[in-house]
Every structure is written in C-alpha cells, then in structure tokens.
Amino acid sequence: QPSCRQEEFLVGDECCPMCNPGYHVKQVCSEHTGTVCAPCPPQTYTAHANGLSKCLPCGVCDPDMGLLTWQECSSWKDTVCRCIPGYFCENQDGSHCSTCLQHTTCPPGQRVEKRGTHDQDTVCADCLTGTFSLGGTQEECLPWTNCSAFQQEVRRGTNSTDTTCSSQ
C-alpha cells in the first residue's frame, strides 16, 4: 500500500491531491483527472487541505456553558467562541473554547494582582504585612489604621482585618 505525500489522501491504492480549505471531495481522482472539489455548504467548514467527503459541522456557542459567539463560522474556519464577561475559558482546544468558569473572587487577605480575561482566571496575591484586604475585586491592600494617641490598640490588624482601636 503506498504512503501518500502530505496533502494527498489514499483512495484504494492511489494517492489523490486533497481539496483546498473551504472545500470537500466531490469526486476522487482517476488516471487522467484530478480530485473534484465542492464548496462547503452553509454552517459547515474545512480548515485545512483535506480528503473529506463531507465538510465538518460548525460549532455552536452554548450560552448555558457561559459561551458567546466571537467569530462566525466561515467555509474555511470554525466558529470561535468566547466566554461571557466575568468568565474565563477552562477547556481551550486551539481557538475553540468548550467550557467557561466564573472568574475567581479573591478571598479576604488577598488582592487582585491581575484581572481575569476571557481566557485567563483572576490572579490573586497576598497582602503584605501592615496591609489588609476584605477580598473581592480590590486591587490594592489597604494599610492598617494607626490608632491615635488618644486610642488604644484593641486588636492588631491581620491580612484580612484592619486594626481595632478603642473608642476612648
């Protein structure tokens, strides 16, 4: 059995040239004639040179999975899905996203170091000593309150709580 060159496909014991992206095989090659190709029908595509008898169905962006259509399908390119605002892609296969997850909310004691995007989760960072954060979408940790000369420090601040000063 012959091994076909790249961008050829095997038909019986003959190698036929593949069809261009956006096309599929309508009629395989013969002794004196090459491969006859046909354009992909609407809502189908082929992204590469191929020996397919049918084009591939275009992907559908499922809103229930947190997806929206970013780029419509064309005869040579699959639909490109993106996550809705506030979500990032958990499963990325090339340019195709199948599931989205909600951006992480930074816990108390951490701040947002890098905001989440459609393809990356939020990156959180610990507050430095002397600062605190209640978490959420805070991008800066706040410095602990310095109790005034007329106040007494009841409880020292932590990375998630401010200093508690006496009211006297």
């Epitope: 790249q6 050829e8 593949m18 009629q27 090659c29 090459g34 040179a49």
Partner: antibody
Framework: EVQLLESGGGLVQPGGSLRLSCAAS????????MSWVRQAPGKGLEWVSL????????YYADSVKGRFTISHDNSKNTLYLQMNSLRAEDTAVYYC??????????????WGQGTLVTVSS | EIVLTQSPGTLSLSPGERATLSCRAS??????LAWYQQKPGQAPRLLIY???TLSSGIPDRFSGSGSGTDFTLTISRLEPEDFAVYYC??????????FGQGTKVEIK
C-alpha cells in the same frame, strides 16, 4: 475541421454588460466540459469558468463569481459567457476551451482564437 | 488555492540547445500537471498532461517529468518554432484551476 470560434468581444464601459459566444464544430459539443480562460494584455492565463456537458455543474473563479454566468445551447453547439458589472480588470482576451477528461479537474486540448474584451470609460 | 511558480521568467537560448523549464506547486498536485505552449497572437496549445504524457501531434523532443510539487518541462533540442511562452497548469485539486505565470523562451 475541429474548431472553436469566439465572438461578442468589444469595448464596454465599467459597470456595463457583454455576452460572449463560442461556436463549436467538428466534435460532439454535448459530451464535453467547456471552459472560458482569459488573458489580460501582456499577462498570463487565468481560468474563468467551466460548465459540464449537462449544464448541471457550473464553476467560477472567485474574481468573477456573482458577475459572470456560463451557459450553453447543445442544439446550437454554442457556449456563452454573460458578463455583468464589468470592471477595468476584466479587460482581456477571452478564450473558449474544451476540457479533456470530462471533469473540472482536467486539461484543455482545444482552444479558440480568442475575443478581446476592453472595459474602459 | 494552489499557486504555481514557474522559473526562470525568461530563458535565452540558441536553436539546437536544451531547454529546462521548472514549475513548482505550493502543495502537492500529484501527477496532475499540464504544460502549454503559446506563441504571440495565438491561443495556447496543450503539450503535456499527467506530468509526462505527450499530447497527440506533439514532437517527442518535448518531455515532462516530476510529481507532487516539482515539475520540469524539457525541450531536448530547440527548433526555431519552439521559441514561445510556456505555461504549467495544475488540475490536481479543482476548483479553481490554476496556471503558472509563464516562462518565455527567447532566441539568444
């Protein structure tokens, strides 16, 4: 004698229309795939369109899709190319050619002498 | 689409010399490549199909070789009537049918 004879070329304004004809003789027209191939002045060959003997399969180059229409009349042994919305870049000698192998994926074994189409204002 | 690149653009030779013309495809077209000859003011004429099969009535000083992406047209001994423009055409995967930009064989 086996031959192809084109006619219908001429000067036309941009946006105008023209209909080319190709009369075949000496062979059975109704059993051959027929094509139009053009050649801009001083340039190379560019395939334009092809029709199957039954007329059910028609193919077009992207550059003419939606503007040109290929057809034939087997009883008159004649191939046609209706050209609408003509542009300056459509200026060329248009050849009628017979396909060998009866498929779009074949070669051209018989050519007409060509007819000149000039698109200019 | 499959792009065909012919080289050289012009070939200057004397009658009796050997001419070697090249045609390279942007991807494999198998053996489905044809060569045409065109003289000034005339229509093209089919010389070779299936990369190496001589069309009827074509003298055997013309020969073709190659497969996949690299093809060659050879004229073993140039006759005065062979000075012309030569085009390659792929029909491995259509539509579209594509031609090379041509090689001019001129008298040196």
């Amino acid at each position: 004698e086996v031959q192809l004879l084109e006619s219908g070329g001429g000067l036309v304004q941009p946006g105008g229309s023209l209909r080319l004809s190709c009369a075949a003789s000496g062979f059975t027209f109704s059993t051959n795939y027929m094509s139009w191939v053009r050649q801009a002045p001083g340039k190379g060959l560019e395939w334009v369109s092809l029709i199957s003997y039954s007329g059910s399969n028609k193919y077009y180059a992207d550059s003419v899709k939606g503007r040109f229409t290929i057809s034939h009349d087997n009883s008159k042994n004649t191939l046609y190319l209706q050209m609408n919305s003509l542009r300056a870049e459509d200026t060329a000698v248009y050849y009628c050619a017979r396909g060998r192998g009866n498929t779009i994926s074949g070669t051209f074994d018989l050519w007409g002498q060509g007819t000149l189409v000039t698109v200019s204002s | 689409e499959i792009v065909l690149t012919q080289s050289p653009g012009t070939l200057s030779l004397s009658p009796g010399e050997r001419a070697t013309l090249s045609c390279r495809a942007s991807r494999s077209v198998g053996k489905y490549l044809a060569w045409y000859q065109q003289k000034p003011g005339q229509a093209p004429r089919l010389l070779i199909y299936s990369a190496s099969t001589l069309s009827s009535g074509i003298p055997d000083r013309f020969s073709g070789s190659g497969s996949g992406t690299d093809f060659t047209l050879t004229i073993s001994r140039l006759e005065p009537e062979d000075f012309a423009v030569y085009y390659c055409q792929q029909y491995g995967s259509s539509p579209p049918i594509t031609f090379g930009q041509g090689t001019k064989v001129e008298i040196k």
